[in-house]
Interface confidence: low
């Protein structure tokens, strides 16, 4: 991301990551994908987990990893904070385990900054309910 010319941010073209509070990204992402199409392919494998509803932050978290936020002001992509990762992992890892899957190493929470500050910028994400209840369904983009 050396000079301004190369640094241009790209619109997010992955439908499940649109309308999440930021709309531009820059590849490669935080797991090494150079193309959004490759990122989208891997993101779709998480769709059942998103649909399950284990964490209201899951979709935002995954998008922040696979299409991290880009801003013209900083020359590095802004991904998730470790705290959001841990919150999502705490809720969703048991669901994954129940269906015979392990928490992916690519989403190892130690890879992400513990909190957002000037030295390590990251996204805290939307607030999460302490217990996910059907009557308090995850607030999603476009909620009325």
């Amino acid at each position: 991301f050396g000079d301004e010319e190369e640094r241009r941010c790209d619109p997010i073209r992955i439908s499940m990551c649109q309308n999440l509070g930021y709309n531009v990204t820059k590849m490669p992402n935080l797991v090494g994908h150079e193309l959004q199409t490759d990122a989208e392919l891997q993101l779709t494998t998480f769709t059942p987990l998103i649909q399950y509803g284990c964490s209201s932050q899951l979709q935002f978290f995954l998008c922040s990893v696979y299409v991290p936020m880009c801003t013209e002001k900083i020359n590095i992509p802004i991904g998730p904070c470790g705290g959001m990762c841990l919150s999502v992992k705490r809720r969703c890892e048991p669901v994954l385990k129940e269906f015979g899957f392990a928490w992916p190493e690519s989403l190892n929470c130690s890879k992400f900054p513990p909190q957002n500050d000037h030295n390590h910028m990251c996204m805290e994400g939307p607030g999460d309910e302490e217990v996910p209840l059907p009557h308090k369904t995850p607030i999603q983009p476009g909620e009325e």
Partner: antibody, heavy 118, light 110 residues
Framework: EVQLVESGGGLVQPGGSLRLSCAAS????????IHWVRQAPGKGLEWVAS????????YYADSVKGRFTISADTSKNTAYLQMNSLRAEDTAVYYC???????????WGQGTLVTVSS | DIQMTQSPSSLSASVGDRVTITCRAS??????VAWYQQKPGKAPKLLIY???SLYSGVPSRFSGSRSGTDFTLTISSLQPEDFATYYC????????????FGQGTKVEIK
């Protein structure tokens, strides 16, 4: 307030078609499973079809596969069930429903009656 | 596809009785099991989700539990408004048949 309102039910002859609508309010259908569940007179609940429209995933019960099509128009916040080649055994009250955590159906519509008879 | 065998199909009980309804899955399933109450002419109402979590606004006399492939709905002290039909629902992770309902249990006044 979350609401689901079905419409489109009625009397149809065997082999005919009908399209049911489910108008949702109070939430965005793009980010929830929407299901159609039916109940024949005096019988139990039978799952018919489901859609998760933000990912374009659809699912069908074997009994309706190839005859019924579930769809959604997110701009209208409405889900549909297109029913073709209807049979007498499709006679039922059809409920539109929404599920959230762990596929628990937390909101149901009032139901619309479909009668297939000659 | 997974079958959910619900038993009994009907039962007679008195106000104050403890009532237990069971659903047995035909194969190992997740805890994505819900229980519903339905009264004649009305849509079902969610009671229990994730096998044992009480849905908001549902009286605490209702509870759910799991033991292997057996899922149980218990009404600790039956009330007059509890006479209804109860259904279990199992949901798959990702597959052909997303939702399976049990056959229902009608709880009648003795």
């Amino acid at each position: 307030e979350v609401q689901l309102v079905e419409s489109g039910g009625g009397l149809v002859q065997p082999g005919g078609s009908l399209r049911l609508s489910c108008a949702a309010s109070g939430f965005n259908i793009s980010y929830y499973y929407i299901h159609w569940v039916r109940q024949a007179p005096g019988k139990g609940l039978e799952w018919v079809a489901s859609i998760y429209s933000s990912s374009s995933y659809t699912y069908y019960a074997d009994s309706v596969k190839g005859r019924f099509t579930i769809s959604a128009d997110t701009s209208k916040n409405t889900a549909y069930l297109q029913m073709n080649s209807l049979r007498a055994e499709d006679t039922a009250v059809y409920y539109c429903a929404r599920s959230s955590y762990a596929w628990a159906i937390d909101y149901w519509g009032q139901g619309t009656l479909v009668t297939v008879s000659s | 596809d997974i079958q959910m065998t619900q038993s009994p199909s009907s039962l007679s009980a008195s106000v104050g009785d403890r009532v237990t309804i069971t659903c047995r899955a035909s194969q190992s399933v997740s805890s994505a099991v819900a229980w519903y109450q339905q009264k004649p002419g009305k849509a079902p109402k969610l009671l229990i989700y994730s096998a044992s979590s009480l849905y908001s606004g549902v009286p605490s006399r209702f509870s759910g539990s799991r033991s292997g492939t057996d899922f149980t709905l218990t009404i600790s002290s039956l009330q007059p408004e509890d006479f209804a039909t109860y259904y279990c629902q199992q949901s798959g992770w990702w597959g052909v048949s997303l939702i399976t309902f049990g056959q229902g249990t009608k709880v009648e006044i003795k």
